[in-house]
C-alpha cells in the first residue's frame, strides 16, 4: 500500500464567547486538514480525534466518526471543530482576552490531531501537532493560505 498523507493546514476560524461571572472563555476552533490517498483503491476515514492544549493543559477535545471515503489518488479537505474552555486556574487569561484597548489578543495553542483510516480491514493512525496563534478576543476567520505556518519561536510584532 502507498501512503495516506495527512496535512494540518491551520485554523480556519475561532469563535469566542465569555461567561463574565465565571471569568471563563469559550473558544470554538475550526481547523482544516488535507487528507491525500496515494493508493489505487479507496480508503475510509474512520475517525478524527483532536485536542487543543494551552500551556500543557488540555482545554478541549473532539472526535468525529465515520467521516468520509477518499477515492483512489484523491484528496479531501476536512474541517473539524474543537470546543475549548479556558477557565479555573487559567482565569487570568480572561483579563487579557477581554482587554478592549488591544485589538489582537493572540494566545499560542497546540493543536493535536489523529486521523484513523481503514482499507481492506487494516487500520492506520496518523498524528500531527502544530502550535498556532489564536485570537481569544474576537471572532476571527483566518486566511489559511496566509497563515498556514505560524512560527511561534519568532517574537510577535
Amino acid at each position: 500500500p502507498r501512503s495516506i498523507e495527512v496535512k494540518y493546514i491551520g485554523v480556519k476560524s475561532a469563535y469566542v464567547s465569555y461567561d463574565a461571572e465565571k471569568r471563563t472563555i469559550y473558544l470554538n476552533i475550526t481547523n482544516t486538514l488535507n487528507i491525500t490517498n496515494n493508493n489505487y483503491y479507496s480508503v475510509e476515514v474512520e475517525n478524527i480525534t483532536a485536542q487543543v492544549q494551552f500551556s500543557k493543559t488540555v482545554i478541549g477535545k473532539a472526535r468525529l466518526n465515520n467521516i468520509t471515503n477518499i477515492g483512489p489518488l484523491d484528496m479531501k479537505q476536512i474541517d473539524y471543530t474543537v470546543p475549548t474552555v479556558i477557565a479555573e486556574e487559567m482565569s487570568y487569561m480572561y483579563d487579557f482576552c477581554t482587554l478592549l484597548s488591544i485589538k489582537v489578543h493572540n494566545i499560542v495553542l497546540m493543536m493535536q490531531v489523529t486521523v484513523t483510516t481503514a482499507y481492506f480491514g487494516h487500520s492506520e493512525q496518523i498524528s500531527q501537532e502544530r502550535y498556532q496563534y489564536v485570537d481569544c478576543g474576537r471572532n476571527t476567520t483566518y486566511q489559511l493560505a496566509q497563515s498556514e505556518y505560524l512560527n511561534v519561536l519568532q517574537p510577535q510584532q
Epitope: A20, E21, F96, T98, L99, L100, S101, K103, N106
Partner: antibody, heavy 120, light 112 residues
Framework: DVQLQQSGAELVRPGASVKLSCTAS????????MYWVKQRPEQGLEWIGR????????ENAPKFRGMATMTADTSSNTAYLQLNSLTSEDTAVYYC?????????????WGHGTSVTVSS | DVLMTQTPLSLPVSLGDQASISCRSS???????????LEWYLQKPGQAPKLLID???NRFSGVPDRFSGSGSGTDFTLKISRVEAEDLGVYYC?????????FGSGTKLEIK
C-alpha cells in the same frame, strides 16, 4: 523599541485645516488600535477617537465628528488626524497613543504630542 | 456620553501623607463582558500622561505599590499611601467601557 513619532508644531489660520501624523516604529500598526487625545492649554484630556489601521474603521467622540478625521497608511506605518474648520477652541496639544501587549505584558505608549495653534 | 466627575480639583498634601482622589461616572461603566474599564493616569508638566492603573485596581507595570485603585459600578477611588515628590502632577480617571471613552476633569496633586 516601540516609539510614536508625531509631526511638528503647527500654526494655522482660523477656518483652515491641518493634518497631523503619528509614525510608529517597533510594531506594525495594522495589528493595533491607534487613539487620538486632545489637551487644550491648562485643560484636561479629551478622547477624540480611535482607528483600526487595518481596515480604516473608526470610532469618534460625537463632539469631534465631522471636525476630526482619522486615517492610517499601513505601508508607512503612520496614523493621521485631520482637523477641519479650525477655531481658537482647537488650539491644543494632540497626542496619538496605542496599547501593545501579549498575555504576559501590556504597555501603554504615547507620542510626545503635536502643538496646534489657531491664530489669525 | 459617560460623564466622569473627579473630586477634588486640587489636592494639597505634605510629602509622606496619604492622598485620595475620587471619580464618579454618570452611569455604570461595567461592560457587557463583566469587566469595568476604569483607568487612572498621571500627567506631569510638559509630559504625556502615563497609565497607572487599569480595570479599577490592576497596577500597570512599573507602578509602585503605594498606588492602589478601588471601587465598582459608578464610584472609584485612587489612593496614594505615602506621597513622594515624583507623584506630583495631574491625575485623570478614564472610562474605556462605553464609546465615546471619556476622561475625568483631573485632580492636581500639589505640595501643601
Amino acid at each position: 523599541d516601540v516609539q510614536l513619532q508625531q509631526s511638528g508644531a503647527e500654526l494655522v489660520r482660523p477656518g483652515a485645516s491641518v493634518k497631523l501624523s503619528c509614525t510608529a516604529s517597533g510594531f506594525n500598526i495594522k495589528d493595533y488600535y491607534m487613539y487620538w487625545v486632545k489637551q487644550r492649554p491648562e485643560q484636561g484630556l479629551e478622547w477624540i477617537g480611535r482607528i483600526d489601521p487595518e481596515d480604516g474603521d473608526t470610532e469618534n467622540a460625537p463632539k469631534f465628528r465631522g471636525m476630526a478625521t482619522m486615517t492610517a497608511d499601513t505601508s508607512s506605518n503612520t496614523a493621521y488626524l485631520q482637523l477641519n474648520s479650525l477655531t481658537s477652541e482647537d488650539t491644543a496639544v494632540y497626542y496619538c497613543t496605542t496599547r501593545i501587549g501579549n498575555l504576559y505584558h501590556v504597555m501603554d505608549y504615547w507620542g510626545h504630542g503635536t502643538s496646534v495653534t489657531v491664530s489669525s | 456620553d459617560v460623564l466622569m466627575t473627579q473630586t477634588p480639583l486640587s489636592l494639597p498634601v505634605s510629602l509622606g501623607d496619604q492622598a485620595s482622589i475620587s471619580c464618579r461616572s454618570s452611569q455604570s461603566i461595567v461592560h457587557s463582558n463583566g469587566n469595568t474599564y476604569l483607568e487612572w493616569y498621571l500627567q506631569k508638566p510638559g509630559q504625556a500622561p502615563k497609565l497607572l492603573i487599569d480595570k479599577v485596581f490592576n497596577r500597570f507595570s512599573g507602578v509602585p505599590d503605594r498606588f492602589s485603585g478601588s471601587g465598582s459600578g459608578t464610584d472609584f477611588t485612587l489612593k496614594i499611601s505615602r506621597v513622594e515628590a515624583e507623584d506630583l502632577g495631574v491625575y485623570y480617571c478614564f472610562q474605556g467601557s462605553h464609546v465615546p471613552f471619556t476622561f475625568g476633569s483631573g485632580t492636581k496633586l500639589e505640595i501643601k
